[in-house]
């Protein structure tokens, strides 16, 4: 297993609709054809997997149908979007990139993106 540098923004504010997008960029040492991207969430020293996708270079990322993540790739960059976020989901989201094929296997873990999520103010009742 060889180490690889992964860069991501330090802090991002999700939209009022609970959507956060950020770029995860990795310094690929070779010409990988198969890449796996995993988003991990760290909160109170507990790490959980948010979503993961394996893709072939030049193809779209395919997450599971019920995943809260979507993404696109361009060269050594992955544009990740996480949706359905609530204030309680505020935390550190870490991008993990694995170059699966061809060998050698490379692993890179970013420093994490702090995603802040603000629940929208409830609309005041209105009379019609």
């Amino acid at each position: 297993c060889k180490a690889m540098h992964v860069a991501q923004p330090a802090v991002v504010l999700a939209s009022s609709r609970g959507i956060a997008s950020f770029v995860c960029e990795y310094a690929s040492p070779g010409k990988a054809t198969e890449v796996r991207v995993t988003v991990l969430r760290q909160a109170d020293s507990q790490v959980t997997e948010v979503c993961a996708a394996t893709y072939m270079m030049g193809n779209e990322l395919t997450f599971l149908d019920d995943s809260i993540c979507t993404g696109t790739s361009s060269g050594n960059q992955v544009n990740l979007t996480i949706q359905g976020l609530r204030a309680m989901d505020t935390g550190l989201y870490i991008c993990k990139v694995e170059l699966m094929y061809p060998p050698p296997y490379y692993l890179g873990i970013g420093n994490g993106t702090q995603i802040y999520v603000i629940d929208p103010e409830p609309c005041p009742d209105s009379d019609f």
């Epitope: 923004p9 802090v11 991002v12 504010l13 939209s15 420093n111």
Partner: antibody, heavy 121, light 108 residues
């Protein structure tokens, strides 16, 4: 080295608007956020809101909602805070501060020098 | 919104004495998101402590922070003349990123 340099003092009449700038240097501007904080004469610090320089999304203090707008110009690494419909109790020193996050910890590590805004008829 | 209460409002001490400042939150705050600032007249605030207990770059080791949940403490082990100032806590756990009202440390 990281620096935040703010625009100069302003004197405004009640009902007018003011726009304070905060030019950042020494770091990757879009990686972090910018907090705006104000301090009325002899009073404590009041958080006004923040902007994510990465995507331009904003979060404002409820009491200022509708009167304040925070923006960034990533081409010049500058953040702006505009406050409208000024009142005498908006007289304060306005600070910008970098919102830094690392390893799950967030705080304002670098501050601008402050901009005095005086609202007087 | 999380309300931060600081006590005492004013602390009158002599150089060389120990200062203990309290910051209490109305609801639990992760220690990762609690910071302390020092402010002197006519100056911008200066970061002292982040993550409840980590000293910022260049801050002398006489300053220390502790606490978790709703109770946090800033301790100055031996007051130096330059330490007489106002101290604020701030939380970044949830918006709004509220400040405490401050504790003024002045010379007795």
């Amino acid at each position: 080295q990281v620096q935040l340099v703010q625009s100069g003092a302003e004197v405004k009449k009640p009902g007018a608007s003011v726009k304070v700038s905060c030019k950042a240097s020494g770091y990757t501007f879009t990686s972090y956020g910018i907090n705006w904080v104000r301090q009325a004469p002899g009073q404590g610090l009041e958080w006004m809101g923040w902007i994510s320089a990465y995507n331009g999304n904003t979060n404002y203090a409820q009491k200022l909602q509708g009167r304040v707008t925070m923006t960034t110009d990533t081409s010049t690494s500058t953040a702006y805070m505009e406050l409208r419909s000024l009142r005498s109790d908006d007289t304060a020193v306005y600070y910008c501060a970098r919102l830094y996050c690392s390893g799950g910890s967030c705080y304002s590590d670098y501050w601008g020098q402050g901009t005095l805004v005086t609202v007087s008829s | 919104e999380i309300v931060l209460t600081q006590s005492p409002g004013t602390l009158s001490l002599s150089p060389g004495e120990r200062a203990t400042l309290s910051c209490r939150a109305s609801q639990s705050v992760s220690s990762s998101y609690l910071a302390w600032y020092q402010q002197k007249p006519g100056q911008a605030p200066r970061l002292l402590i982040y993550g409840a207990s980590s000293r910022a770059t260049g801050i002398p080791d006489r300053f220390s922070g502790s606490g978790s949940g709703t109770d946090f403490t800033l301790t100055i082990s031996r007051l130096e003349p330059e330490d007489f100032a106002v101290y604020y806590c701030q939380q970044y756990g949830s918006s709004p990123f509220t400040f405490g009202p401050g504790t003024k440390v002045d010379i007795k």
